[in-house]
Interface confidence: low
């Protein structure tokens, strides 16, 4: 028998695939500064291979550390507006449990659209991250300029 | 015998290692908004394991879903020019088959000269994507400022 | 035996789980560019598991192709002063062992005051990378808006 | 050359439906958001609906929501809007427009067909 | 009653220069785009984003916004600008909404 089998074998559904991408559903009423995301097939190109949806928000299924990146542009925004609207925020962030309330990733429009950026960080099962934009501006939902979505990458 | 080798066991051959990592070559003649790439060692840094170039776009070799990630930095920019020829956009998408044909990913370059982001997506063998970058303003070849890559993340 | 055990199995620990993610430890002295990193559970959400940190620079433990990534927000930082400061830019690269170095990523700020990017790139045991911020401007220490990592994606 | 083509207007009575087609040639169909906006005999431009790229987000304005349905192929260049429950203020030059895809942008109509007659009368 | 105020009519005399505003509160936060249509015609862009103009628009279009207002200037009306003059924006959901429409003589 072949060395690499005498060593630890990794089974298929162990690999930890989880992985989700999904697109903007809504903003929130006033004083709720969170992006409300949806996800699967049906909408288009987004998807949830393991992470669910809880009211909007993404919860993690299992532990590890994941890759979590985001785009987000700003709707009817030109560089005169973004500046004009200053500051407009957004920022990725562990909301729940709250003992592990944390922010995540975090950028300001400044004079542009649109902010992306990725990073890779330690989710536990049952974490609940939230994207809040704050200022006076709406994200588009163009499906291609705002997307949110997470990646597990190892144990 | 071991547990996890009474489950399914994953060869190598099948991890889908696809990956691609590419440089601009040159853009398209006029009416032709799309940047045409190369790859490979002799080239410097990039890369093809798996996707292929036709005709300086990229073909996928294997179903999946992928990390797409991009940068695109304009040639000869400040932000002064960046505005004045404004708007200078960067989109990338599936170009063929034509029935699939959809826009994966959109950004505009405002007052800035560099774009850059990443999304996760569904591909599926023989998808070709495109890079169009529409505006009067060319990319720069530098291989640190300009590229454009794919990396097999599941099945 | 079924036909997957049949072929090259894929022990665990082969799989190059070599992964970081790093945040801002301190800039240096007068005329060393250089971004110093630092990581670890006890900092909060940054880590190490393969690469090293050298005088705060990342080197690599394993050969591959590597997703790198990096974010950086300049602190005390609105356009206006990314504009009156400009150039500020960052680059990363291989800065040792000298017959390798070469710039991977490079982004300037322009009227923003966040850059980021990613890239794949390959990789060998003992390069070490070092991220260039050059101009007057300093960057945010911020976990959430300066970062630094590199993901192990194949062979 | 940007061409948008309308066809499938005409008369029809109160309550009854009409489909009109949009057929979009020279330019890369499947990046643009797209809306049909409508001219009522002497009067000015009304908005309608409009739908993302991917065709899996639609919006409508409230004086068609529940009546009007827009849609599209992207794989024949083609957008649609099916009007049922028509009412007689519905009469109007329909157009199919292009969004320029600045789309972070307020929508801005750069391409515009010759538009198609609705009627609608007993 | 359209969201986007702007004048009925407009009169300016050959050469001369002409100005349409459009008042809304929606321009306080958003772009304004404006249109020219003539009689039979469908609409054609003539200026984006309060004050860009695209290819093929003579120079003598021009836009500006300040708060709540937007106006397209006309320098040296010619003959063939008359026709009529749509201001457009968005509402809060990103909606397109229009002005009522000026119509434009040049006399």
């Known amino acids: 028998q072949r060395f690499a089998q005498a060593q630890q074998q990794l089974p298929l559904e162990s690999l930890g695939w989880d992985v989700a991408e999904l697109q903007l559903n809504h903003t929130g009423p006033q004083q709720d500064p969170r992006l409300y995301w949806q996800g699967g097939p049906a909408l288009g190109r987004s998807f949830l291979h393991g992470p669910e949806l809880d009211k909007g928000q993404l919860r993690i299924h299992r532990d590890g550390i994941y890759m979590v990146h985001i785009q987000v542009t700003l709707a009817i925004c030109s560089s005169t507006t973004a500046s004009r609207h200053h500051p407009t925020t957004l920022a990725v962030g562990i909301c729940s449990p709250a003992s592990r309330s944390i922010s995540l990733l975090r950028l300001s429009f400044h004079q542009g659209c649109t902010i992306a950026s990725q990073r890779l960080t330690p989710l536990a099962r049952g974490d609940t991250l939230c994207t809040n934009l704050t200022g006076t501006l709406l994200p588009s939902r163009n499906t291609d300029e705002t997307f949110f979505g997470v990646q597990w990458v190892r144990p | 015998q071991r547990f996890a080798q009474a489950q399914q066991q994953l060869p190598l051959e099948s991890l889908g290692w696809d990956v691609a990592e590419l440089q601009l070559n040159h853009t398209g003649p006029q009416q032709d908004p799309r940047l045409y790439w190369q790859g490979g060692p002799a080239l410097g840094r990039s890369f093809l394991h798996g996707p292929e170039l036709d005709k300086g776009q990229l073909r996928i070799h294997r179903d999946g879903i992928y990390m797409v990630h991009i940068q695109v930095t304009l040639a000869i920019c400040s932000s002064t020019t960046a505005s004045r020829h404004h708007p200078t956009t960067l989109a990338v998408g599936i170009c063929s088959p034509a029935s699939r044909s959809i826009s994966l990913l959109r950004l505009s370059f405002h007052q800035g000269c560099t774009i850059a982001s990443q999304r996760l997506t569904p591909l599926a063998r023989g998808d070709t994507l495109c890079t169009n970058l529409t505006g009067t303003l060319l990319p720069s070849r530098n291989t640190d400022e300009t590229f454009f890559g794919v990396q097999w993340v599941r099945p | 035996q079924r036909f997957a055990q049949a072929q090259q199995q894929l022990p665990l620990e082969s799989l190059g789980w070599d992964v970081a993610e790093l945040q801002l430890n301190h800039t240096g002295p007068q005329q060393d560019p250089r971004l110093y990193w630092q990581g670890g559970p006890a900092l909060g959400r940054s880590f190490l598991h393969g690469p090293e940190l050298d005088k705060g620079q990342l080197r690599i433990h394993r050969d591959g192709i590597y997703m790198v990534h990096i974010q950086v927000t300049l602190a005390i930082c609105s356009s206006t002063t990314a504009s009156r400061h400009h150039p500020t830019t960052l680059a990363v690269g291989i800065c040792s062992p000298a017959s390798r170095s070469i710039s991977l990523l490079r982004l300037s700020f322009h009227q923003g005051c966040t850059i980021a990017s990613q890239r794949l790139t390959p990789l060998a045991r003992g390069d070490t990378l070092c991220t260039n911020l050059t101009g007057t401007l300093l960057p945010s220490r911020n976990t959430d808006e300066t970062f630094f990592g590199v993901q192990w994606v194949r062979p | 050359e940007v061409q948008l083509v309308e066809s499938g207007g005409g008369l029809v009575q109160p309550g009854g439906s009409l489909r009109l087609s949009c057929a979009a040639s020279?330019?890369?169909?499947?990046?643009?958001?797209m809306n049909w906006v409508r001219q009522a005999p002497g009067k000015g431009l009304e908005w309608v609906s409009d739908?993302?790229?991917?065709?899996?987000?639609?919006y409508y304005a409230d004086s068609v929501k529940g009546r009007f349905t827009i849609s599209r192929d992207n794989a024949k260049n083609t957008l649609t809007l099916q009007m049922n429950s028509l009412k007689p203020e519905d009469t109007a030059l329909y157009y199919c427009?292009?969004?320029?895809?600045?789309?972070?942008?307020?929508?801005?109509?750069?391409?515009w067909g010759q538009g198609t007659q609705v009627i609608v009368a007993s | 009653q359209s969201a986007l105020t702007q004048p009925s009519t407009v009169s300016v005399s050959l050469g001369q220069t002409a100005r349409i505003t459009c008042r809304g509160d929606?321009?306080?936060?958003?772009?304004t785009n404006w249109y020219q249509q003539k009689p039979g015609q469908a609409p054609v862009l003539v200026i984006y984003?309060?004050?860009s103009r695209p290819s093929g628009i003579p120079e003598r279009f021009s836009g500006s916004s300040s708060g709540a207002t937007a106006a397209l200037t006309i320098s040296g009306a010619q003959a063939e600008d008359e026709g009529d003059y749509y201001c457009?924006?968005?509402?809060?959901?990103?909606?397109?909404?229009f002005g009522g429409g000026t119509h434009l003589t040049v006399l």
């Open positions: 984003d309060d004050d």
């Open positions: 020279g330019f890369t169909f499947s990046v643009y958001y």
């Open positions: 427009v292009r969004d320029a895809g600045y789309s972070n942008h307020v929508p801005i109509f750069d391409s």
């Open positions: 739908i993302n790229n991917e065709g899996g987000t639609t």
């Open positions: 457009q924006s968005a509402d809060s959901s990103g909606n397109a909404v």
């Open positions: 929606s321009l306080e936060r958003y772009g």
